[in-house]
């Protein structure tokens, strides 16, 4: 195909791929009609003047995973048709000024995973058609004002995984078309008021894994189109009352791994489209009434691994669409009988690793669609008669690691469990803790007469059997997997996956997967 270098493969579709450690310079001659050129995993260390001069029809150029550390300013001369240029995963520390001059058609520029120490306004001043700029995984410590001023058409900017300690409030001011801004894994401690004011079309803002301690009250007030806001793994101890007030399109908010002690009233709202709220790994100690009442479409609420010891009876008011509620690994001892009554669509509740000593008999009275209940590792000695009777869809119930008291009062529960054994799972069954003579024996097969020989055991009505449908999939809802799992985080690494499957790690988690960011 018009002379393909021996180190490369060339396809009919005008695609050229050159790979291998033997390659130490750009192979020649390259086919004049090449439209896509990939130079991958070579030992090329520099690009000299005009190595691509004879392939002016080139549209995509990937020079990735090489030893590239030096580029001559005229390296990309004569590539006026180039739309996609990737120099990712090389060893570039410096970009020569004017390197991208003449690349008038360039839309995507990937400079990620290099060792760039700085960028200057002159670097990108010629790239007026650029839509995507990837700078993540470099060593940038600051972004000078004006660096992006000419990139008015930019829709995606990734500055994640750098060493940024502060951001100028003016650096993004001309990026009115930006839809995605990623600043994750930097060293930002605060973000000045006004930093995001010009980003009126922003849909995703990733600020996770920084050291942000305080959010300015009006920080997001101009970002009315924001859909995904990632604030996890920072040092946020307080949320200003109005900080999320102007975000009507938001559908995912992550705040896990911060230092939140309380959720101020009205903090979440109105957010009519929010579907997921991730709050685990904070220091929240109580949930007042109506704290989530503006989140009418919320489906996933993760409050695990906090210090919650009190939930007000109206804390979950308004959450009529909630499917998954994670409260595991907290300090709950009591639950008011009305606390879950609004959660008519709840499918999965995790309450494991708390200090619950008893449950109200009507705790699940309105929650008819429950499919999975995690109650393991609490202080439960018995459960009220009929607590699960109406839960016809229940297919997963975890009761192990509780100090079950196997006296005559346990009979109704024992009988119900006997009839509904498949729901308990096969890994760990509940065992008796007392009396001493039956400690360690399975609650399901225990002979209660043996446990308390001196007590006459009356005929106790058993828990009526709820039908068990072995053919019913546990989670027909596509956003769920086994309820004993919970991702460490909603996926924020921007892979192309739409669903992440996770494996069971009961000691830490207790919910479902999420979908990729």
């Amino acid at each position: 195909y018009h002379g393909c270098p021996s180190e490369c493969t060339c396809s009919r579709a005008s695609q050229v791929e050159c790979t291998g450690a033997r390659i130490v310079a750009v192979p020649t001659p390259l086919p004049w009609n090449a439209m896509s050129l990939q130079i991958l995993n070579t030992h090329i260390t520099e690009l000299n003047e005009s190595p691509f001069l004879n392939i002016s029809a080139l549209i995509a150029l990937r020079i990735e995973k090489n030893e590239l550390s030096r580029i001559t300013p005229g390296a990309f001369r004569n590539l006026g048709s180039l739309r996609y240029l990737s120099l990712a995963n090389n060893k570039l520390q410096v970009l020569p000024i004017g390197l991208f001059q003449g690349l008038d058609s360039l839309e995507s520029l990937l400079l990620s995973s290099n060792q760039l120490l700085q960028i200057q306004p002159a670097h990108f001043s010629q790239c007026s058609n650029l839509k995507e700029l990837q700078l993540h995984g470099n060593h940038l410590e600051y972004i000078p004002d004006g660096a992006f001023d000419h990139l008015v058409g930019l829709t995606k900017l990734n500055l994640g995984k750098n060493s940024l300690t502060h951001i100028s409030p003016r650096v993004f001011q001309h990026l009115g078309n930006l839809q995605v801004l990623r600043l994750y894994e930097n060293r930002l401690t605060d973000i000045p008021m006004g930093t995001f004011d010009g980003l009126v079309n922003l849909q995703e803002l990733a600020l996770q894994q920084n050291q942000i301690g305080l959010l300015s009250p009006g920080l997001f007030h101009n970002n009315h189109n924001l859909q995904r806001l990632y604030l996890s793994n920072n040092h946020i101890s307080q949320l200003p009352p109005s900080v999320f007030m102007q975000l009507p399109q938001l559908n995912r908010l992550t705040l896990f791994g911060n230092s939140l002690k309380e959720l101020s009233p009205g903090i979440f709202g109105p957010m009519p489209n929010l579907r997921e709220l991730w709050l685990y790994d904070n220091h929240i100690s109580s949930l007042p009434d109506n704290v989530f009442s503006n989140l009418r479409q919320l489906q996933v609420l993760i409050l695990s691994r906090n210090q919650i010891s009190f939930i007000s009876p109206g804390a979950f008011n308004g959450l009529t669409e909630l499917r998954e509620l994670s409260l595991h690994t907290n300090a709950l001892q009591d639950l008011d009988g009305n606390v879950f009554r609004m959660l008519a669509n709840l499918q999965n509740i995790s309450l494991q690793n708390n200090r619950l000593r008893q449950l109200p008999g009507n705790i699940f009275a309105n929650v008819n669609g429950l499919m999975a209940i995690q109650l393991q590792n609490n202080q439960l000695e018995n459960l009220p008669l009929g607590i699960f009777d109406h839960l016809g869809k229940l297919c997963e119930l975890r009761l192990y690691d509780n100090p079950w008291r196997c006296d005559s009062d346990i009979l109704p529960l024992r009988n119900w469990l006997l009839l509904n054994q498949p729901r308990l799972g096969t890994d760990t069954v509940p065992v008796c803790f007392s009396p001493a003579n039956v400690r360690g024996q399975s609650l399901i097969i225990i002979n209660v007469n043996v446990a308390v020989p001196s007590v006459h055991v009356p005929e106790v009505p058993s828990y009526p059997e709820t039908p068990w449908y072995p053919d019913t999939p546990s989670y027909p809802d596509t956003t769920s997997v086994s309820s004993t799992t919970e991702l460490t985080s909603p996926v924020e690494d921007y892979t192309d996956l739409t669903t992440i499957q996770v494996t069971d790690d009961r000691s830490v988690w207790g919910m479902t997967q999420a979908q990729s960011g």
Epitope: D289, N338, P360
Partner: antibody, heavy 118, light 107 residues
């Protein structure tokens, strides 16, 4: 229907203790928090704390910490509020009250007048 | 502690009058405010919860509004049985606190 019936009026001397009872009926006693609220003559209402009958867990207002004790007897569906080291300012009507679908007081006892006088 | 400042402390009105009582919280309490009516020698009675929701059996002439720090109880057309003392209460954070009360008297 939910009913909270309190014990009768008490007269106590300063320094003494008083124990007021509140008997609940019409619902599952152990499943809902019960609060105590007091009202001095001609004055407003003051929240004292709550007890969860199912576990006996309590939370007291800082002002009463160390002087108030709330207890429960599940066999009789009764909660008790004991206030010690009484002083004249403790003269008030003491109410037990139960939350409804939120932490507001939907159900009230009839009140118990405690008079502290030498 | 959150202070609930109620005003006026008393008012005189006639049957049929529109009466407005306000309550100001010393900090944001969201919508976690209730209003009670109390008649002499009786326990308080819940009128409004979550700032604006009428308790069951409460006549529609009673309405509540507000959020954050400023709240209002309105009686659209005062009836003879409405002469009583009214209290607001915040239940957003412990200790739960009440306003000082507003006594509604016959003019």
């Amino acid at each position: 229907q939910v009913q909270l019936v309190q014990s009768g009026a008490e007269v106590k001397k300063p320094g003494a203790s008083v124990k007021v009872s509140c008997k609940a009926s019409g619902y599952t006693f152990t499943d809902y928090y019960i609060n105590w609220v007091r009202q001095a003559p001609g004055q407003g209402l003051e929240w004292m704390g709550w007890i969860y009958p199912g576990s006996g867990n309590t939370k007291y207002a800082q002002k009463f910490q160390g002087r108030v004790t709330m207890t429960v007897d599940t066999s009789t569906s009764t909660v008790y509020m004991e206030l010690s080291s009484l002083r004249s300012e403790d003269t008030a009507v003491y109410y037990c009250a139960r939350w409804g679908y939120g932490a507001y007081f939907t159900y009230w006892g009839q009140g118990t007048l405690v008079t502290v006088s030498s | 502690d959150i202070q609930m400042t109620q005003s006026p402390s008393s008012l005189s009105a006639s049957v049929g009058d529109r009466v407005t009582i306000t309550c100001k919280a010393s900090q944001n309490v969201g919508i976690n405010v209730a209003w009670y009516q109390q008649k002499p020698g009786k326990a308080p009675k819940l009128l409004i919860y979550s700032a604006s929701y009428r308790s069951s059996g409460v006549p529609s002439r009673f309405s509540g509004s507000g959020s954050g720090t400023d709240f209002t109880l309105t009686i659209s057309s005062l009836q003879p049985e409405d002469f009583a003392t009214y209290y607001c209460q915040q239940y957003n954070s412990f200790p739960y606190t009440f306003g000082g009360g507003t006594k509604v008297e016959i003019k």
